[in-house]
């Protein structure tokens, strides 16, 4: 299949990935679908270096990432292993807090104003970051 060798216009290249930073807010599921329609996924943070890069671009603003526990265990949207992977939770987070009064707990992860992570109600309209890998083969079948 074809390969993406450079980032689309409006996207930022970093370490062989392309990132797009929203400037408005959506619920987590809408942000997830948004990235999928761009052949991307909500950002998956795999290192402290990537954390710093994303944090630099989003500033002190609540921003969704591609991490959720809507089906039980915490999972990254691209299948990256959560248990062995990089984590940057705020102290005492995630806490699946029910006291917000919105029904249910907190199943979606976001960057907080200091960059550390918190779990929150997935319906909150936060900004989001899409990520796609360079040199990733597209999902089209090869031409025969």
């Amino acid at each position: 299949g074809s390969e993406r060798t450079c980032c689309p216009v409006n996207w930022v290249e970093h370490e062989r990935s392309c990132y797009w930073f929203s400037r408005s807010g959506k619920a987590w599921a809408d942000a997830d679908n948004y990235c999928r329609l761009e052949d991307a996924h909500l950002v998956v943070v795999t290192s402290w270096e990537e954390q710093k890069f994303v944090q630099h671009h989003i500033g002190p603003v609540n921003t969704w990432m591609g991490l959720h526990d809507q089906n039980g265990p915490w999972k990254w949207v691209d299948g990256t292993d959560y248990e062995t992977g990089f984590k940057n939770w705020r102290p005492e987070q995630p806490d699946d807090w029910y006291g917000h009064g919105l029904g249910g707990g907190e199943d979606c992860a976001h960057f907080t104003d200091d960059g550390r992570w918190n779990d929150d109600v997935c319906q909150r309209p936060y900004r989001w970051v899409c990520e796609t890998e360079l040199d990733k083969a597209s999902q089209e079948p090869p031409l025969l």
Epitope: P8, W11, D30, N33, Y34, L37, D39, P125
Partner: antibody, heavy 123, light 109 residues
Framework: EVKLLESGGGLVQPGGSLRLSCAAS????????MSWVRQAPGKGLEWVSV????????FYADSVKGRFTISRDNSKNTLYLQMSSLRAGDTAVYFC????????????????WGQGTMVTVSS | DIQMTQSPSSLFASVGDRVTITCRAS??????LNWYQQKPGRAPKLLIY???SLQSGVPSRFSGSGSGTDFTLTINSLQPEDFATYYC???????????FGRGTKLEIK
């Protein structure tokens, strides 16, 4: 000139199948999500399906899920809609439309439309 | 799902009039609202995006306003070519199922 041209519409019996095509020109086709939107006679616009630029992500309206399949051939700059188990309620003009998001455009919108192709489901 | 309610469903006006069409969302959509114009037998055409931004080539007599749940499309000094059906569309939900209003048909009085 940026252009979309649908074809493949016609009269089909209930339960039958039909494949619509949409030929794109004037823009880099594989950079954009593409969609089908339909309009029943005298009615409003109803979104049917959308897929990403590579074709890797697809989404459907509940009313067509399991019956319609959206696909694309980026080497031919063509979008398709395979329709099966057709019902009278599927009778409509089917438009293909480019979906441009704010990750690429100044907006999130259907910004380029074809002229439409009529699908009539009747015995 | 977010429901979009347009009013009125039809509107009679004369050339030179100022007309307003409203669109209400069942929950807040911030400014994620587009307006389209459709003439009989033709494809819809994007007029306004993000509530108030005019698409390239659209005359300045068209304007949009609103935020949250209530939005308006205003046409100042109606021209003969403006008689058409107008649809609002929310894009807060990325998947646009039920995202269009039912339309407002603007007809000559």
């Amino acid at each position: 000139e940026v252009k979309l041209l649908e074809s493949g519409g016609g009269l089909v019996q209930p339960g039958g199948s039909l494949r619509l095509s949409c030929a794109a020109s004037g823009f880099t086709f594989n950079n954009y999500a593409m969609s089908w939107v339909r309009q029943a006679p005298g009615k409003g616009l109803e979104w049917v399906s959308v897929l990403s630029g590579s074709g890797g992500s697809t989404f459907y309206a509940d009313s067509v899920k399991g019956r319609f399949t959206i696909s694309r051939d980026n080497s031919k700059n063509t979008l398709y809609l395979q329709m099966s188990s057709l019902r009278a309620g599927d009778t409509a003009v089917y438009f293909c439309a480019r979906y441009c998001s704010s990750a690429r455009c100044p907006y999130d919108a259907f910004d380029i439309w074809g002229q439409g192709t009529m699908v009539t489901v009747s015995s | 799902d977010i429901q979009m309610t347009q009013s009125p469903s039809s509107l009679f006006a004369s050339v030179g009039d100022r007309v307003t069409i409203t669109c209400r969302a069942s929950q807040s959509i911030s400014d994620y609202l587009n307006w389209y114009q459709q003439k009989p037998g033709r494809a819809p055409k994007l007029l306004i995006y993000d509530t108030s931004s005019l698409q390239s080539g659209v005359p300045s007599r068209f304007s949009g306003s609103g935020s949250g749940t209530d939005f308006t499309l205003t046409i100042n000094s109606l021209q003969p070519e403006d008689f058409a059906t107008y649809y609002c569309q929310q894009t807060y939900n990325i998947l646009p199922e039920r995202s269009f209003g039912r339309g407002t048909k603007l007809e000559i009085k």
